[in-house]
Structure formats: C-alpha cells, structure tokens
C-alpha cells in the first residue's frame, strides 16, 4: 500500500505519457489522477512502466472503481490486464466481444492463465451460452478451449456454434466430451451431402453410436485409421467385418498394425476368425470356427 503524500510542485500529470516512467512509486500515486488514467488507459500500453509502477496504476484504478472496472476501461487495459487477479476480474461485467478479443490478444500465444480463464467464464456466463462468434474467437486464441469444458458446460453449446469448430480444436477432448458434442454436430451438419458431411463430422466421431457407424459404412467414406482408433470401443464392437471393411475402404489394411490396440484388439476378439480371414490381413484372435457365441447381455435384458 502506497502512503498518501502530496504531489511535488510542477509534477502533476496533465496526461499519461512517457515522462511518468521517471516518477517514483509515491509520485505516481500522488501526481496521477485516477480519472485521467481511466480515460487515457490506452496510452499505458505504449509506455515502458516497471512492474512496480503498474502495481501503482492498478491500485489507483481499484480505488476509483471498488465495485469493478467499467467496460470502457477494461477494453484498454492492455498488459495491465496481466496484473489483475481472478478476484478482480470476477467483479467485471464484460459483454462486448471486442473487449474479450482485446484482452485475449494480450495473452496471445501463451497458455490460458487464471486471469484469462476467469475472464472467459465471466463472459460466457453473462451471455448465457457459447454462441458461434464467441466460440470462433475463443478457439482462434485457444484451440484446446472446447476440450477444457466439462460435458455439462458443453451442453450449453448450441448446434449452430459447431460450425466454428476446427479438427484441431477437438484434439484433447475425451470420449465424455465427444459424447456431448457429436449429437450437436450431427444436427448442425444434417443438411450436407454424403462426402461433405463426412469431412465435417469426422472429428466428432469419437462420440458416435454403433448405428451411425453402420450408416456411414454404407456411404463409401473411407475412414482413416487415426479416426477409427478414436471411436468408442462399445460403438465399434457390434460392427461386422463387412461393415468395418466398408467403413475403412482402402484403409482397412491398417488394421494389422493396430491389432494389439483398442478398439481394434477388442473388436477382433468379437469376430469369427473365418470372417477375419476374408480380409486377408492375417488378423488373429477371432472366435474359432464351430464355437457358439452367446450374447449374455441380450439374455439378461430378456430375463
């Protein structure tokens, strides 16, 4: 806390400019009017203030706006934003996407800081849902943003926003998150034709159920192995050898290299060996010929 001292004669700041970097902490406190600082906040970013001087400037704004800064000040915080704590940011009411962009720009190229996470949380809660423009902005700055949300939070994403999602935005999503996103993507892309639909839906298929995979197998989609390996194991297991062959097309040969990994390993265990042999890939581990397969889960359901 900086002590209250009178401003020396002739040192009163008329504007926020570079001469202020030569002021000591107490001089900044005494000679810079907080209201002046608030109206000329955009100038701070062009002045090489020290960390300590930034602390003084922040303190002045805190005193002027104890209930939280107005958006007109927030939008021009620049690198002073990085001096804010999550507690400070929780007092703000940020409604403009331009303000959000301006502050994300300050942290561009770096991992999401606690300040940025709090800012985004405040912004999204204020909007009530993750609309397309917001999602566009957030994934542009933080490709992994979508996958940092819980399935509950993802449920508030409207299907229309899915158009903003790029494949790399889903790289770190787990199956629970894809379970929520897949139905939204299916709805969003439902009016597209076969090949275009597959290109768009491909990144979301880690949340697809068996029946949708069966339907895709009838459309000559030629799914690559990387996508296949990300499918839900429980969705892959009921697929027949013929369906997997149609689903993968020319990529079916890649199964051999993945035969020890899920979901391929578990799928092989569920297939008849003579069906696997028809692929000519040398896949081993299927159900030997002559064995009867009982689906106990079906039996339990009937009883």
């Amino acid at each position: 806390e900086v002590e209250k001292t009178a401003c020396p004669s002739g040192k009163k700041a008329r504007e926020i400019d570079e001469s202020l970097i030569f002021y000591k902490k107490w001089e900044l406190e005494a000679c810079v009017d907080a209201a002046l600082l608030a109206t000329q906040m955009d100038r701070v970013n062009a002045i090489p203030f020290t960390y300590e001087q930034l602390d003084v400037l922040k303190h002045k704004l805190d005193e002027l706006y104890p209930q939280g800064y107005p958006e007109s000040v927030i939008q021009h915080l620049g690198y002073l934003f990085l001096k804010m704590s999550p507690e400070d940011i929780r007092k703000w009411n940020v409604t403009s996407l331009e303000t959000l962009k301006a502050l994300l720009e300050v942290n561009k190229g770096h991992e999401m800081s606690p300040q940025v996470a709090t800012l985004i949380d405040r912004f999204v809660k204020g909007r009530g849902q993750l609309d397309k423009d917001t999602l566009d902005t957030l994934t542009a700055f933080y490709p992994g943003y979508l996958c940092s949300l819980s399935p509950e939070e993802l449920s508030s994403v409207p299907p229309s926003s899915i158009w903003a999602v790029r494949p790399q935005d889903l790289d770190t999503c787990d199956p629970r998150q894809l379970d929520v996103l897949y139905p939204k993507a299916r709805l969003a892309f439902q009016n597209m034709n076969g090949s275009e639909y597959f290109v768009k839906i491909q990144s979301f298929l880690g949340g697809a159920p068996t029946e949708d995979l069966k339907a895709l197998s009838q459309q000559n989609v030629s799914m690559d192995l990387a996508t296949f390996m990300k499918l839900r194991t429980d969705a892959v297991l009921p697929l027949t050898v013929a369906e997997v062959q149609k689903l993968l097309g020319p990529h079916v040969e890649g199964l051999k290299a993945e035969e020890r990994h899920r979901p391929v390993r578990d799928w092989i265990l569920r297939q008849r060996q003579d069906d696997l042999d028809t692929l000519g890939l040398g896949l081993q581990g299927g159900i030997p010929n002559g064995y009867l397969v009982l689906d106990l889960s079906m039996q339990e359901a009937l009883s």
Epitope: P48, F49, T50, Y51, E52, L54, D55, L82, G109, H110
Partner: antibody
Framework: QVQLVESGGGVVQPGRSLRLSCAAS????????MNWVRQAPGKGLEWVAV????????YYADSVKGRFTISRDNSKNTLYLQMNSLRAEDTAVYYC????????????WGQGTLVTVSS | DIQMTQSPSTLSASVGDRVTITCRAS??????LAWYQQKPGKAPKLLIY???SLESGVPSRFSGSGSGTEFTLTISNLQPDDFATFYC?????????FGQGTKVEIK
Amino acid sequence: QVQLVESGGGVVQPGRSLRLSCAASGFTFSSDGMNWVRQAPGKGLEWVAVIWNDGSNKYYADSVKGRFTISRDNSKNTLYLQMNSLRAEDTAVYYCARDRGPLWPLDYWGQGTLVTVSS
Amino acid sequence: DIQMTQSPSTLSASVGDRVTITCRASQSISRWLAWYQQKPGKAPKLLIYKASSLESGVPSRFSGSGSGTEFTLTISNLQPDDFATFYCQQYTSYSRTFGQGTKVEIK
C-alpha cells in the same frame, strides 16, 4: 551493485531432472522480473522463460513448455528453473537476467552455469 | 511467436570502420528492440534499448535506429574492444526472442 549468480549446473542423463538457482543482490529483487536465457555451445542466445516480479505471470519458449518451470522466492532473493525430461538439445550455458517491466530489456545478466545432458 | 532475423551473420571489418548490422522482425514490434554485445566466455551486455536509447556507460559510437520491423545497429568508429558477437532482441511480447547473432571479426 547488481549481482546475479547462477548455480546448479552439471552433467545429467537424458530424461532426468535438474534445478538451477540464481541468487540476486544489489537491487530490490521483488520489484523486478527475472528471465532465463540459454546458449548452446557455439550457438546463439535463446530466451527460455520469464517470471514477473510477484510471480503472477510466467511465460516460456515453445521449446521448453511443459518441461521447464520458472519460479522465485522473493524472501530469499532467488530465482529457480526446474528442468524435467531433459534432452541432449537442452545442453547449454544458462544465464539468469533481470528486466524491470513487460516492456523492458534484459539489463543485468549473471555469468551463467553450464548444463550438459549426455548419457 | 515473433521471429527475428539478423544480417549479416559474419562481418569482417578493420579498426576505425563504420559497421552496420540489420535486424528484421516478422511482425511490427514498434520500437521495443534491444541490442546486446557478447564476448567469448562472457555474459551478454545491453548496449541499446527501445531501438535507439543508449544504455548508460555504453560509448556513443554505438547507435541504433528503426521502428516497426526494420532496425539497425551502427558502430561509427570500430575499436579493438568492439570485436564480438551482437544480438538483437524483441521484447514487445512476453516471449522475448533473439536474432541469431552477427559476429564482427577483424579483417
């Protein structure tokens, strides 16, 4: 006068960890930002990481993100660099250097400590 | 990240020469550029900051200019003590990046 003295360097095997320290004196340590910069043998300078005066913000070069952690103890006037999952390409002289603000250059440097990653 | 490109990588000169080193940024960095001098086995030393401001104690034969993406370091009257490697560095973003260096050697 400002003095920065690095320590903790040495020979370490790939995949192992090492912690470097930088003892600061001659200025108000808690007021200034601190950086680590490295220089591989016969190569140029590579900025590694920065930590703000109060430890509130830390930034890293892409080459060390997720493996190295910068930290400071203002009560001990000491800067640290925790280096995990070390690789041969991390072999370098590591310097600590001071900056006074986000838009300030590195005005004081230590003499460096050599880290050699080799099996 | 912002890339910094220095040229030339090596420069041969004689005592008394005027030498110029160029540094180019991959995007505008306003005037947030520093120049450092490093001698073998020693730590780098700050010469110029904010593109053209001379660090205290640095001889006036060193000067810097430029803004945006193009910057130059000039040594007006090369002295025996000036043979070293020079680096530019941007500090407009929190990832501070260096140029690859320019070695000034005796012709």
